[in-house]
Amino acid sequence: MRTEAQVPALQPPEPGLEGAMGHRTLVLPWVLLTLCVTAGTPEVWVQVRMEATELSSFTIRCGFLGSGSISLVTVSWGGPNGAGGTTLAVLHPERGIRQWAPARQARWETQSSISLILEGSGASSPCANTTFCCKFASFPEGSWEACGSLPPSSDPGLSAPPTPAPILRADLAGILGVSGVLLFGCVYLLHLLRRHKHRPAPRLQPSRTSPQAPRARAWAPSQASQAALHVPYATINTSCRPATLDTAHPHGGPSWWASLPTHAAHRPQGPAAWASTPIPARGSFVSVENGLYAQAGERPPHTGPGLTLFPDPRGPRAMEGPLGVR
């Protein structure tokens, strides 16, 4: 959840008082301060309820509590997306919505929340504590996923208020990258402020060799670094059997949208809900958890009017031998 910190206004030092370190001490604290003020741990909430009108129909609502912009939402059934569940719907702010049975109606409720109705006819309804998961890919927080289920004792038409995730998983950039950088930044900022307070103002001493202020860079872990670090998380009893404790390993972010430009908001939206852009397989991309995805492999040939979410549907989440990514 985003937290706002009250920070006293800092008076910029008088011009000419800063020496060789002037540029850095002026720019860096402000960059770090901005990060510290706007920083907070994003959260994903999931609400599952059974409709009173149609007893076998479920409504899943998910929301993202964070300050970043959402680039993709994936809803899955049976477990986390990319780690045991099957995709029910994929919602993209511009390319539209794609859904698979038994999803009946997926839609955006707000800019940061979605809802999904699961059909009740034709198949048996999922058992009361079936797992439903929502994964939000956002910039700059990374990918955050939460899972929820309908409590077995729930009355039709009733549901618990949306609660923060029974499981809250951030892919490594979210946890280690942003949090680590911010923690370090905030500590460093305090250190700078303390030093600035206790140190007499240096004389003006221009130097041609003064280092430039370091540029802020997006932290983008490679898939190799992700693979090396596992983030275990536990599920509550969300299966139709006795509770089991599962350890899952984070996968790269959803690289189906890899061909999106850096600033997707400026991309003109076509009339079709899904653009006819070929999207390569997960394995052919290096996932960058800040919501921007860099292509590592060759762009596949355009194969038709439908959106090619990945050229090799038998393609893996990890390489699967000769049938893996081409």
Partner: antibody
Framework: QVQLQQSGPEVVRPGVSVKISCKGS????????MHWVKQSHAKSLEWIGI????????NYNQKFKGKATMTVDKSSSTAYMELARLTSEDSAIYYC???????????WGQGTLVTVSA | QIVLTQSPAIMSASPGEKVTMTCNAS?????MYWYQQKPISSPRLLIY???NLASGVPVRFSGSGSGTSYSLTIGRMEAEDAATYYC?????????FGAGTKVEVK
């Protein structure tokens, strides 16, 4: 490479149950859901249901509810389907099929022939 | 449930000939999937999302359609294409398949 190895053919008497298996290899077993599909001369291909290996959650075609029960054993990377109270109508080839990265029957087992005969 | 009707049920084609088969849905579906099954073999994914070729599928195969009407085309028939072709929808549970179109080589 990804392989789904199913158990051998079964010849059973009417009224009894049979449990067939599908062992996955070449991929991380809990990461993908499994489907079961029936193929008979009379009805072509029929979808029986889906099971999440990860959570054990299931969803059945209403037609097969009470007839088929899907389970998994993660430790042996095996999915099972038990067919109860067998009749001649249940004589068919049963396939397990794994999804790809999005829903579709990307990989299929070789099939298990179940023959119900008195 | 959504009923998928395939036609023709059986057809023959000479090598090099263009082959087209259709699949009509009882209600609108978003995408169609096509599978090829040869005798004594399991079905094999051929086309997904209406028009996209699965891995290893020759480019002579193509799919098209929308709403309730879909088709699969073999640009130039080859002997190895003799098989039964099934369409399948993923828009509504229960998932359903067509009865199949059997393609024989003349």
């Amino acid at each position: 490479q990804v392989q789904l190895q199913q158990s051998g053919p079964e010849v059973v008497r009417p009224g009894v149950s049979v449990k067939i298996s599908c062992k996955g290899s070449g991929y991380k077993f809990p990461d993908y859901v499994m489907h079961w599909v029936k193929q008979s001369h009379a009805k072509s291909l029929e979808w029986i249901g889906i099971i999440s290996i990860y959570s054990g959650n299931t969803n059945y075609n209403q037609k097969f509810k009470g007839k088929a029960t899907m389970t998994v054993d993660k430790s042996s990377s095996t999915a099972y389907m038990e067919l109860a109270r067998l009749t001649s109508e249940d004589s068919a080839i049963y396939y397990c099929a794994r999804e790809g990265d999005l829903p579709m029957f990307a990989y299929w087992g070789q099939g298990t022939l179940v023959t119900v005969s008195a | 449930q959504i009923v998928l009707t395939q036609s023709p049920a059986i057809m023959s084609a000479s090598p090099g000939e263009k082959v087209t088969m259709t699949c009509n849905a009882s209600s609108s579906v978003s995408y169609m999937y096509w599978y090829q099954q040869k005798p004594i073999s399991s079905p094999r994914l051929l086309i997904y999302d209406t028009s996209n070729l699965a891995s290893g599928v020759p480019v002579r195969f193509s799919g098209s359609g929308s709403g309730t009407s879909y088709s699969l085309t073999i640009g130039r028939m080859e002997a190895e294409d003799a098989a039964t072709y099934y369409c399948q929808q993923w828009s509504s549970y229960p998932l359903t398949f067509g009865a199949g179109t059997k393609v024989e080589v003349k």
